[in-house]
């Protein structure tokens, strides 16, 4: 298949990935769908270096990432292993807090104002970050 060799317009390249930073909000699922329709996914943070890069671009604003536990265990949207992977939760998080009065707990992860992670109600309209990897084979058929 063909491969993406450079980032789309308005996306930022970093370490062979492309990132797009929203400036408005959506619920987690709607943000996830937006990224998918752009052949991307909500950002998956795999290192401290990537954490600092994303944090630099989003500033002190609540921002969704591609991590959730809506089906039980915490999972990254691209299949990256959560248990063995990078984590940057705030102290005492995630806590699946039910006290917000919105029904249910907290199943979606976001960057907080200091960059550390918190779990929150997935319906909150936060900003989000999409990520897609360069050199990743697309699903187009090969040109003959």
């Amino acid at each position: 298949g063909s491969e993406r060799t450079c980032c789309p317009v308005n996306w930022v390249e970093h370490e062979r990935s492309c990132y797009w930073f929203s400036r408005s909000g959506k619920a987690w699922a709607d943000a996830d769908n937006y990224c998918r329709l752009e052949d991307a996914h909500l950002v998956v943070v795999t290192s401290w270096e990537e954490q600092k890069f994303v944090q630099h671009h989003i500033g002190p604003v609540n921002t969704w990432m591609g991590l959730h536990d809506q089906n039980g265990p915490w999972k990254w949207v691209d299949g990256t292993d959560y248990e063995t992977g990078f984590k940057n939760w705030r102290p005492e998080q995630p806590d699946d807090w039910y006290g917000h009065g919105l029904g249910g707990g907290e199943d979606c992860a976001h960057f907080t104002d200091d960059g550390r992670w918190n779990d929150d109600v997935c319906q909150r309209p936060y900003r989000w970050v999409c990520e897609t990897e360069l050199d990743k084979a697309s699903q187009e058929p090969p040109l003959l």
């Epitope: 408005s24 959506k26 619920a27 709607d30 937006y34 998918r36 329709l37 752009e38 309209p125 699903q139």
Partner: antibody
Framework: EVQLLESGGGLVQPGGSLRLSCAAS????????MSWVRQAPGKGLDWVSV????????FYADSVKGRFTISRDNSKSTLYLQMNSLRAEDTAVYYC??????????????WGQGTLVTVSS | DIQMTQSPSSVSASVGDRVTITCRAS??????LAWYQQKPGKAPKLLIY???SLQSGVPSRFSGSGSGTDFTLTISSLQPEDFATYYC?????????FGPGTKVDIK
Amino acid sequence: EVQLLESGGGLVQPGGSLRLSCAASGFTFSSYAMSWVRQAPGKGLDWVSVISGSGGSTFYADSVKGRFTISRDNSKSTLYLQMNSLRAEDTAVYYCASAIAAAGAHYFDYWGQGTLVTVSS
Amino acid sequence: DIQMTQSPSSVSASVGDRVTITCRASRDINGWLAWYQQKPGKAPKLLIYTVSSLQSGVPSRFSGSGSGTDFTLTISSLQPEDFATYYCQQSNSFPFTFGPGTKVDIK
């Protein structure tokens, strides 16, 4: 100049199938999500389906889920809609449209002229 | 699903008039709203996206505003070519949904 040209419409019996095509030119087809939107005679606009630039992600309206399949061939710059188990309520003009990403949402910036699908016995 | 409603369903106006069309969403759509114009027998045309951004080539007499669930399309001085049907559309959530349309015709 961007052009989208639909074809494949016609008269089909209830329960039948039809495949619509949309030939695109004038832009980098593989870089854009593409969508189908329909309009029943004398009625408003009804979103049907959308597909990402690579074809890797698809979304459907509940009314067509499981019956319609959106696909694309980027080597031919062509979008498709396979319609099975057609019903009278699927009768409409079917438009293909490019779905531009603007600030965090997708909007339909270029449209074809439409192709009429009539489901009747 | 998010339901979109429009009012009025039709409006009669004269050239030069200021015309206002409102669109209401059944829940907050976070500003992800577009407006389209459609003339009889033709495909729709994108006028405005993300509430107030004017699509390239669209005259400045068209403007959009609003937030939350309530939005407005304004034509500041109606021109002969503006007689058409106008639709709002939300892109906040799948399924994308359109309003039922507002027909602007000649008084």
